[in-house]
Interface confidence: medium
């Protein structure tokens, strides 16, 4: 009965084995998660362009319980949140506030999930339901990736490795399942 005291947080549940939806966008900037000091940015180096390798992502660990309808995971899972300023970036003077602000210089680099891991969890349900086994997809590492334009389609490019990604500004969707289908799966009636 240890599940009774669990927090009502959720981590994405893989609908089917082998099917990997993108993590929800709010994972990358969620108030309830661990935050890096100084907004996750690297130390200030005024007017100096840094090499991309010096602006690696921060991998912030956070722990949450998996939920599926009325059920809670027996144990919390630990995941990473990708945070930080990817270079090259410059610290430029802000004329209005006499302060400084960061602006990307050159290609648009993003600190995003790089690798994922699947973890099987046991979900405990209240009373009359048997425990459920579920596989969850968790962020395992982060990487700075570069956004470029190619034939009118945006791609996120790894340094040296090309990986097709959803278009910039568009909410990522599961490959084999529409957002609508996913939502329907989440809406239950009892």
């Amino acid at each position: 009965q240890g599940w009774q005291a669990f927090k009502n947080d959720a981590t994405e549940i893989i609908p089917e084995l082998g099917e990997y939806p993108e993590p929800p966008p709010e994972l990358e900037n969620n108030k309830t998660m661990n935050r890096a000091e100084n907004g996750g940015r690297p130390p200030h180096h005024p007017f100096e362009t840094k090499d991309v390798s010096e602006y690696s992502c921060r991998e912030l660990h956070f722990t949450r319980y998996v939920t599926d309808g009325p059920c809670r995971s027996a144990k919390p899972v630990t995941e990473l949140v990708c945070s930080g300023q990817c270079g090259p970036a410059r610290l430029l003077p802000n004329a209005i506030g006499r302060g400084k602000w960061w602006r990307p210089s050159g290609p648009d680099f993003r600190c995003i999930p790089d690798r994922y891991r699947a973890q099987r969890v046991q979900l405990l349900c209240p009373g009359g339901e048997a425990p459920r086994a579920r596989k969850v997809r968790l962020v395992a590492s982060c990487k700075c990736k570069r956004l470029t334009r190619f034939h009118n389609q945006s791609e996120l490019k790894d340094f040296g490795t090309e990986a097709a990604r959803p278009q910039k500004g568009r909410k990522p969707r599961p490959r084999a399942r529409s957002a609508k289908a996913n939502q329907a799966e989440l809406e239950n009636a009892y």
């Epitope: 009965q1 599940w3 009774q4 005291a5 669990f6 927090k7 009502n8 947080d9 959720a10 929800p24 709010e26 969620n30 108030k31 309830t32 939920t67 309808g69 009325p70 809670r72 349900c125 209240p126 009373g127 009359g128 339901e129 939502q183 989440l186 809406e187 239950n188 009892y190």
Partner: antibody
């Protein structure tokens, strides 16, 4: 202090819809499931459904599946319940409640919103 | 759905009395039962979780007990502020259901 502030009383015509809100404060809105409960005049409490603000995913009591639509706005820490095709049977006080650290336990309640359906 | 029956819809008692409110379920709910208090102004307060676990801040004169299909809420020494309607609720499975309520009145 944890507070759930609900909108004031509503007087609506049969067949119309109404959307009532529940603004949460004093805790991290996405950390706790929000629950909606109906209390008809002089009667008991009925569980309408739950919504997980983290994902915005609802679970409904089958009885209210076609009657209620639960949504959230994370930016304003507000939960909403829309009631459709209203009839006199829907006249009631509707409560939002926060499921606390213990599963199934509604440890904080709004003050209730009275909905009266009348022509 | 699990039916929750509070046999007494109302109870009369005097201040200082020991009061017991009962709740019966249509099937064994394995202690997955909560108690709530609703004041005459409509304010609802959570009292007891999992049959007998008192919520922090709830006076110790409140206690809960039971198992299987029979549960009860006891107020050991009735105070004026305890005048309210009390509801049991199960969370054994979905849908959660509530008892019909027991209204506590002063003699």
């Amino acid at each position: 202090e944890i507070q759930l502030q609900q909108t004031g009383p509503e007087l609506v015509k049969p067949g119309a819809s109404v959307k009532i809100s529940c603004k949460a404060s004093g805790y991290s809105f996405t950390d706790n499931i929000m629950v909606w409960v109906k209390q008809s005049h002089g009667k008991s409490l009925e569980w309408i459904g739950n919504i997980n603000p983290y994902y915005g995913s609802p679970s409904y009591n089958l009885k209210f599946k076609d009657k209620a639509t639960l949504t959230v706005d994370k930016s304003s820490s507000t939960a909403y319940m829309q009631l459709n095709s209203l009839t006199s049977e829907d006249s009631a006080v509707y409560y939002c409640a926060r499921e606390g650290g213990n599963y199934g336990s509604l440890d904080n309640w709004g003050q209730g919103t009275s909905v009266t359906v009348s022509s | 759905d699990i039916q929750m029956t509070q046999t007494s819809s109302s109870l009369s008692a005097s201040l200082g009395d020991r009061v017991t409110i009962s709740c019966r379920t249509s099937q064994d709910i394995n202690n997955f039962l909560n108690w709530y208090q609703q004041k005459p102004d409509g304010t609802v307060k959570f009292l007891i979780h999992h049959t007998s676990r008192l919520k922090s801040g709830v006076p110790s004169r409140f206690s809960g007990s039971g198992s299987g299909t029979d549960y009860s809420l006891t107020i050991s020494h009735l105070e004026p502020e305890d005048i309210a309607t009390y509801y049991c609720q199960h969370y054994y499975n979905l849908p959660w259901t509530f008892g019909g309520g027991t209204k506590l009145e002063l003699k």
